[in-house]
């Protein structure tokens, strides 16, 4: 026996008229049934209507063995066709059918919107045998219904390779409006129009939208969902949200911040990573982008040496990486460096300026008055020179590099010697006789090796020749001298 034990909560007038076979209520119905072991009673809507012939999808039974009488066609009894309930309530519904006892192994499956419901669903099938027929009741329960439970449920029974299908039971879960589209945070240009969109659905429908800006309603009359709010422009940041109303109540969207694009904040923490004689590698931490992506940055370099002009060099670079190698700088010079970055609105102020220095460079001039002569008795070549007049930018002199190339009968060999800064002469051993020795000298500082002097050549005769005439650096513009001794 199936009974509907209790009714409570008022029905919601959602439909213009009664639907045949529909139950529009928040009823909680208790069902008294023989329960399978461990099964707890669930809320359900009981099929109290008497069964009536169903001609849609029926199984026509065969003649009995006696051949005397036909069995009636098999069909599911009609049940409630439409269940309307609120979110988070429990629901139970069922299908019932009487099957002649001649049929064995009947199974009932539940389907939702054309897909079989398998696995962890609360479906229970109970059998009530009688002399000629067995009443089968298949119950389906859902605890704490959600919108995703909305749909059309049917029972299917397979019998004699035929399929018997019940009438659909439509489950309509009603609740507060549910947002399918909420406004999004945006960064907008000052005093420029922009749109926000809000969309919410029931059931129940309709859903009406109110817009809220900084806690105040924007529209006095609600708009049907979906709603697009056109904001003519803002001068300062604002927070927008939308309220969605239906007969169940209201839902408020997330509040979204609409930011006004501005020039970026200045970069911070400009720091020096590496300095050479003519370049400085810097990095910086970008400031706040002003709600608009950085486009590029400008590295500003200002001469700050006491007698400098103060010339300003500006180097444009990409916004990332936040690093730049400043080139074309003077050696041993002081610079003030700042960084500014821009977005679509404009340039940031310049970062705090930092002081940076280049290191000493290589000498820019070669040693002067290079002379070379042969000291035959010692089998040496004697080299003399004058210290170049180097500026401090070239760094402190640490020594000299002497290149001597020996050429004889198609053979050429270059050797390098290093001598200390206090020297202004050097002796090198004769490497090859009957050969030409070409000597060049460069000054060396910590900053590097300077230019070599013009080559000075001296001929080294075979043993026995004695002549000590020197070779010396040519006058500017002259060809390289070759002194044969």
């Amino acid at each position: 026996a199936i009974t509907e034990a209790r009714e409570e909560a008022k029905p919601y007038p959602l439909f213009p008229g009664p639907l045949p076979g529909s139950l529009q209520t928040d009823h909680t119905s208790l069902l008294s049934l023989p329960h399978t072991s461990g099964y707890q009673p669930a809320l359900m809507f009981s099929p109290t209507q008497p069964g009536r012939p169903y001609t849609g999808n029926v199984a026509i039974p065969r003649v009995t063995s006696a051949g005397s009488k036909l069995l009636p066609p098999l069909a599911f009894k009609h049940t409630v066709g439409h269940i309307i309930l609120s979110e988070h309530k429990d629901v139970k519904f069922n299908c019932s059918i009487s099957v002649p006892n001649i049929y064995q192994d009947t199974t009932i499956s539940w389907w939702k919107d054309g897909k079989e419901l398998l696995g962890a669903h609360h479906a229970i099938t109970q059998f009530y045998p009688d002399d000629e027929v067995t009443a089968i009741i298949a119950s389906f329960s859902i605890t704490s219904v959600q919108r995703s439970d909305n749909g059309s449920y049917i029972c299917k029974m397979k019998i004699n390779n035929e399929e018997i299908v019940s009438d659909p039971i439509y489950i309509e879960v009603q609740g507060l409006p549910h947002f399918t589209k909420q406004p999004e945070s945006m960064n907008v240009t000052r005093n420029t129009a922009f749109n926000l969109t809000c969309q919410a659905v029931g059931p129940p429908e309709p859903v009406n939208i109110f817009w809220v800006q900084n806690s105040s309603r924007v529209n006095e009359q609600p708009e049907k969902s979906p709603s697009v709010l056109t904001v003519p422009g803002l001068t300062e940041m604002a927070v927008f949200s939308c309220e969605a109303h239906n007969d169940k109540g209201l839902t408020v969207s997330k509040g979204v911040q609409i930011n006004i694009k501005a020039i970026p904040s200045p970069p911070t923490e400009v720091s020096i990573h590496n300095s050479t004689a003519h370049s400085i590698l810097i990095s910086w931490v970008p400031g706040f982008d002003g709600y608009s992506p950085f486009r590029n940055c400008s590295v500003q370099v200002k001469e700050v040496d006491p007698l400098s002009n103060g010339s300003v060099m500006i180097f444009n670079t990409s916004a990332s990486p936040h690093m730049y190698q400043i080139k074309q700088l003077q050696a041993l010079a002081n610079y003030s460096i700042g960084v500014s970055c821009m977005n679509e609105i404009g340039w940031s102020a310049v970062s705090p300026w930092i002081l940076a220095s280049t290191t000493e460079g290589a000498p820019s001039v070669a040693p002067l008055n290079v002379t070379v002569f042969l000291n035959e008795s010692r089998d040496n070549v004697d080299i003399r020179w004058m210290k170049p007049l180097t500026k401090r930018q070239a760094g402190e002199l640490v020594g000299y590099r002497i290149s001597h190339v020996w050429q004889s009968a198609g053979i050429s060999k270059e050797l390098l010697e290093e001598v200390g800064q206090n020297n202004s002469r050097a002796q090198i051993s004769v490497q090859v006789h009957n050969a030409t020795c070409t000597v060049r000298i460069a000054a060396v500082t910590k900053g590097g090796v300077g230019p070599f002097s013009d080559p000075v050549k001296i001929f080294i005769p075979a043993h026995g020749w004695v002549d000590h005439a020197p070779s010396s650096t040519p006058a500017p513009g002259n060809a390289d001298p070759v002194l044969i001794i």
Partner: antibody
Framework: QVQLQQPGAELVKPGASVKVSCKAS????????IHWVKQRPGQGLEWIGR????????NYNQKFKGKATLTVDKSSSTAYMHLTSLTSEDSAVYYC???????WGQGTLVTVSA | ETTVTQSPASLSMAMGEKATIRCITS??????MNWYQQKPGKPPKLLIS???TLRPGVPSRFSSSGYGTDFVLTVENMLSEDVADYYC?????????FGSGTKLEIK
């Protein structure tokens, strides 16, 4: 051509202040240092300080800190030196000079007298 | 602060003679020394800039030498138009400091 224009003279009372101007033309104002130099009558030259119009950054001679304040107005390409709490010791010709002192203004004679 | 000692305070030369003015700095300033000429009622005029570089338009009878702490301005073949006050200015470090000046006169 490069020019630095200064007013010829300013007469001020003791304890008052004066703002000496130096209007630049003929070059990119924001690209070079502007220096200020003091010369008392019949005396030598004293460096007061310098300012870079690009970022308005000044460097002062310690001796003139608190006495002179250097500023620039980029829109009019003008540098200013504000002298405060004037005494007879401040009576002098004040020159502005550009970059590495290759160009000079004609000088402003500031006379402090009751 | 780098101090600059300029000598002599005054110098009287005959026309055509060579005049020599010296500046000594208290710290090494490399080659960062400027030399100026100032005539009465006029601003100083830059003659020679750092690195002993003669400025454009300055007669070649003016020259300078020196490096580190010792610097010399030389005026060859003194002319009457060279009568003026001469100042050196060190640019090795801030604050910039001028020499006390040399008054060059004609005998």
């Amino acid at each position: 051509q490069v020019q630095l224009q200064q007013p010829g003279a300013e007469l001020v009372k003791p304890g008052a202040s004066v703002k000496v101007s130096c209007k630049a033309s003929g070059y990119t104002f924001t690209n070079y240092w502007i220096h200020w130099v003091k010369q008392r009558p019949g005396q030598g030259l004293e460096w007061i300080g310098r300012i870079h119009p690009f970022d308005s950054e000044p460097n002062y001679n310690q001796k003139f800190k608190g006495k002179a304040t250097l500023t620039v107005d980029k829109s009019s390409s003008t540098a200013y030196m504000h002298l405060t709490s004037l005494t007879s010791e401040d009576s002098a010709v004040y020159y502005c000079a550009l970059a590495s002192f290759a160009y000079w203004g004609q000088g402003t004679l500031v006379t402090v007298s009751a | 602060e780098t101090t600059v000692t300029q000598s002599p305070a005054s110098l009287s030369m005959a026309m055509g003679e060579k005049a020599t003015i010296r500046c000594i700095t208290s710290t090494d300033i490399d080659d960062k020394m400027n030399w100026y000429q100032q005539k009465p009622g006029k601003p100083p005029k830059l003659l020679i800039s750092a690195g002993n570089t003669l400025r454009p338009g300055v007669p070649s009878r003016f020259s300078s030498s020196g490096y580190g702490t010792d610097f010399v301005l030389t005026v060859e073949n003194m002319l009457s138009e060279d009568v003026a006050d001469y100042y050196c200015l060190q640019g090795g470090a801030l604050p910039l400091t001028f020499g006390s000046g040399t008054k060059l006169e004609i005998k």
